[in-house]
């Protein structure tokens, strides 16, 4: 294992995670560890000199940066709150407050919204979409021949009972919010009033 700074033929250092090629001196030099930055660039005779990031700044990775990134607070106006503080080697970790969920744009959580568990009223059901989410439910009426009799975010419309399949007759027709009511057929020979 070569100790930086060292010269190399093909500009590819042995440990690319922790070393980098410095073209000005044609040598491989040490990167600075997380939490530090380059205070003095390496030369042919001296390796990189690193220093700890100043207060309220950080570098997350092995680097050869001349500065540290400024810590950014979590934006409480957008519904975020810090779950872990910014340290010299890690930016602040932000998360939506409990009871709030992320609104995503290009795979990034851009702001938080109150979770609204929409209740679909009797006669309607939640529209099925590809997204498996409890928020922003769109309620649609039951199809003809179907009913749904609860206020629920997940209940599905069910087909009306077909009385004849059970050997019964219809006493009251089904609606979008109630099932068909069936009754026993009249006895043979019974007098119809």
């Amino acid at each position: 294992q070569l100790v930086p700074p060292y010269r190399i033929e093909n500009q590819t250092c042995w440990d690319q995670d922790k070393e980098y090629y410095e073209p000005m001196h044609d040598v491989c030099c040490s990167r600075c560890p997380p939490g530090e930055f380059v205070f003095a660039v390496c030369s042919r005779s001296q390796d990189t000199v690193c220093k700890t990031c100043p207060h309220n700044s950080y570098n997350e990775h092995w680097n050869h940066l001349s500065t540290c990134q400024l810590c950014r607070p979590c934006d409480i106006v957008l519904g975020f709150e810090e779950v872990a503080p910014c340290t010299s080697d890690r930016k602040a970790e932000c998360r939506c407050q409990p009871g709030m969920s992320c609104v995503y744009l290009d795979n990034e959580c851009v702001h938080c919204e109150e979770e609204r568990l929409v209740l679909c009223q009797p006669g309607t059901e939640a529209e099925v979409t590809d997204e498996i989410m409890d928020t922003d439910v769109n309620c649609v009426p039951c199809k003809p021949g179907h009913f749904q009799n609860t206020s629920s975010p997940r209940a599905r419309c069910q087909p009306h009972t077909r009385c004849e399949i059970q050997g019964l007759v219809e006493a009251a027709p089904g609606t979008s919010y109630s099932d068909t009511i069936c009754k026993n057929p009249p006895e043979p020979g019974a007098m119809l009033l």
Epitope: E82, P85, E93, R95, Q97, P98
Partner: antibody, heavy 115, light 107 residues
Framework: EVQLVESGGGLVQPGGSLRLSCAAS????????MNWVRQAPGKGLEWVSG????????YYTDSVKGRFTISRDNAKNTLDLQMTSLRAEDAAIYIC????????WGQGTMVTVSS | DIQMTQSPSSLSASVGDRVTITCRAS??????LAWFQQKPGKAPKRLIF???SLDSGVPSRFSGSGSGTDFTLTISSLQPEDFATYYC?????????FGGGTKVEMK
Amino acid sequence: EVQLVESGGGLVQPGGSLRLSCAASGFTFSSYTMNWVRQAPGKGLEWVSGVAPSGDRTYYTDSVKGRFTISRDNAKNTLDLQMTSLRAEDAAIYICAQGFAFTNWGQGTMVTVSS
Amino acid sequence: DIQMTQSPSSLSASVGDRVTITCRASQGISSALAWFQQKPGKAPKRLIFDASSLDSGVPSRFSGSGSGTDFTLTISSLQPEDFATYYCQQYNNYPLTFGGGTKVEMK
């Protein structure tokens, strides 16, 4: 350095009242949900109440709803818990905690409910 | 309310052992879970947040995993200072809830 210092605990009779306070320093108080967590002797941790950063939303565990009131003063960096109609089962160490993920904790103040 | 069920409630182990504690949520909580260590007479100390992120200054022998309803805290090689009680906590929704705790004792 984050510091949370609770005060106001003590001995109170059943049905009595007590006001706990938590003085916070070392962080931007107004940016964090603040919570009270309690621990009865020899028992586990129980979240009691929380208040949103701006103080506009408050949350309580079912057993204290209507009896306890949480409040905060962002100008003074203080968190309070007004406890009324105290019961024997409320006796515990009450600890102030920073953030909804409880990043930092105080040392707690003891509340004893006994006749 | 979201119930957090921790197991085992206690365990005996020796220095150097690999220790695993599990926590199950009664409904999905994404990764909104923290693990805490508490020693007698002391305030709890957070070890892990967001299910798997290690808090600053916490030894790397501690690790967390899981998402949804099932979560695990692992101590890869138990040290003398690790004998304590461990709690999980969900912060997906109010009321915030803790597991019942796992006491790690010396075998």
